[in-house]
């Protein structure tokens, strides 16, 4: 029921989460937690932003994107098998029961002997579109799927870029990432 993302032991994992700020710099508090989103909060918080900045983080967890533009995707550095599990991204939109809640499943695989990333795996991880139904309680948070949204020309370009070990950063900076607001 939640979107699944994969990474290998020793790599950085990327869990996408986006919103569209009402105006540049008009930020919304966001929290990331380990565990499924509870009714009001974020579970065991690993990172938190307020209306201005990242105001709490723990080691290995950081925002690599431009959170001031609503890219609050979480990067987990040098993952281990213990990092597997459900993560909660909660966009704490002001108002009555306006929160956006996303449960994302991270699956950590043992490191491969020959680290040759496949197009499909990295492509999906870098270009997710999260389709969600909205609800006010944990049971009503449901993620419906992860769909790539990119054309064939871009796939051709990406095939070359996939050889680059900086894939996640390059793809995210390419401007093709989908945002939800």
């Amino acid at each position: 029921s939640e979107v699944e993302y994969r990474a290998e032991v020793g790599q950085n994992a990327y869990l996408p989460c986006f919103y569209t700020p009402a105006a540049p710099g008009n930020l919304v508090p966001v929290c990331w937690g380990k565990g499924a989103c509870p009714v009001f909060e974020c579970g065991n918080v690993v990172l938190r932003t307020d209306e201005r900045d990242v105001n709490y983080w723990t080691s290995r967890y950081w925002l690599n994107g431009d959170f001031r533009k609503g890219d609050v995707s979480l990067t987990i550095e040098n993952v281990t098998l213990a990092d597997s599990g459900i993560y909660c991204c909660r966009i704490q939109i002001p108002g009555i029961m306006n929160d956006e809640k996303f449960n994302l499943k991270l699956v950590i695989k043992p490191a491969k002997v020959t680290p040759a990333p496949t197009l499909q795996r990295d492509f999906t991880a870098a270009f997710p579109r999260m389709l969600t139904t909205r609800g006010h309680g944990p049971a009503e948070t449901q993620t419906l799927g992860s769909l790539p949204d990119i054309n064939l020309t871009q796939i051709s370009t990406l095939a070359n870029e996939l050889r680059d070990s900086r894939l996640a950063n390059d793809l995210r900076d390419s401007g093709a990432t989908i945002r939800i607001g």
């Epitope: 499924a36 009714v39 009001f40 909060e41 065991n44 002001p94 309680g137 944990p138 009503e140």
Partner: antibody
Framework: EVKLVESGGGLVKPGGSLKLSCAAS????????MSWVRQIPEKRLEWVAA???????YFPDSVKGRFTISRDNARNICYLQMNSLRSDDTAMYYC?????????????WGQGTTLTVSS | DIVLTQSPASLAVSLGQRATISCRAS??????????MQWYQQKPGQPPKLLIY???NVESGVPARFSGSGSGTDFSLNIHPVEEDDIAMYFC?????????FGAGTKLELK
């Protein structure tokens, strides 16, 4: 030591307004969801409002549009503004701290303040 | 709304015996493997006190004679052996969905 102290209760006429305050101390207030829970004389407990650490608001249908909850993280105070009061709002009102990381249940409660709505 | 039905409404027990209070939810309160059900104790003139969270976790400082069990829609609070200090009202509460809801309470009395 975690402490929650409610104030502002009293006697109000139907249709009137009142603002309750909850002064918190002994913990990092801004990190916690805060709730108001009321208890009618028959001892039943009813959750009436919550505000998350990020400022999102939650209410049951019974008070939606009449009550609002707010917080002042600089002063460590949570408020419950109650408008269009009715006789069935008469109750003991407790301020409660939501458990860290969850918020949906309550590990500390104040002693309560009494609201009586009567003409 | 999730309706919580507590039974019995009152329970008379002898000191040293076991007291069992039940709480049934109108729908499941299971969420990613956790049962989002709590139990509180309330003595006259005092606010409620958290005893058990997530169905079976005993809150810090709560005596080991209190235990919780159950999953899905059916939950129980057990007190064994009952002591005089346990005479109070007991409430269940779900944190699965807004609105948060409580059971009507069970009054524990001495036989």
């Amino acid at each position: 030591e975690v402490k929650l102290v409610e104030s502002g209760g009293g006697l109000v006429k139907p249709g009137g307004s009142l603002k309750l305050s909850c002064a918190a101390s002994g913990f990092t207030f801004s990190r916690y969801a805060m709730s108001w829970v009321r208890q009618i004389p028959e001892k039943r407990l009813e959750w009436v409002a919550a505000i998350s650490s990020g400022g999102s608001l939650y209410f049951p249908d019974s008070v939606k549009g009449r009550f609002t909850i707010s917080r002042d993280n600089a002063r460590n105070i949570c408020y419950l503004q109650m408008n269009s009061l009715r006789s069935d709002d008469t109750a003991m009102y407790y301020c409660a701290r939501g458990r860290e990381a969850d918020g949906g249940y309550f590990d500390y409660w104040g002693q309560g303040t009494t609201l009586t709505v009567s003409s | 709304d999730i309706v919580l039905t507590q039974s019995p409404a009152s329970l008379a027990v002898s000191l040293g015996q076991r007291a069992t209070i039940s709480c049934r939810a109108s729908e499941s309160v299971e969420y990613y493997g956790t049962s989002l059900m709590q139990w509180y104790q309330q003595k006259p003139g005092q606010p409620p006190k958290l005893l058990i969270y997530a169905a079976s976790n005993v809150e810090s400082g709560v005596p080991a004679r209190f235990s919780g069990s159950g999953s899905g829609t059916d939950f129980s609070l057990n007190i064994h052996p009952v002591e005089e200090d346990d005479i109070a009202m007991y409430f269940c509460q779900q944190s699965m969905k807004v609105p948060l809801t409580f059971g009507a309470g069970t009054k524990l009395e001495l036989k």
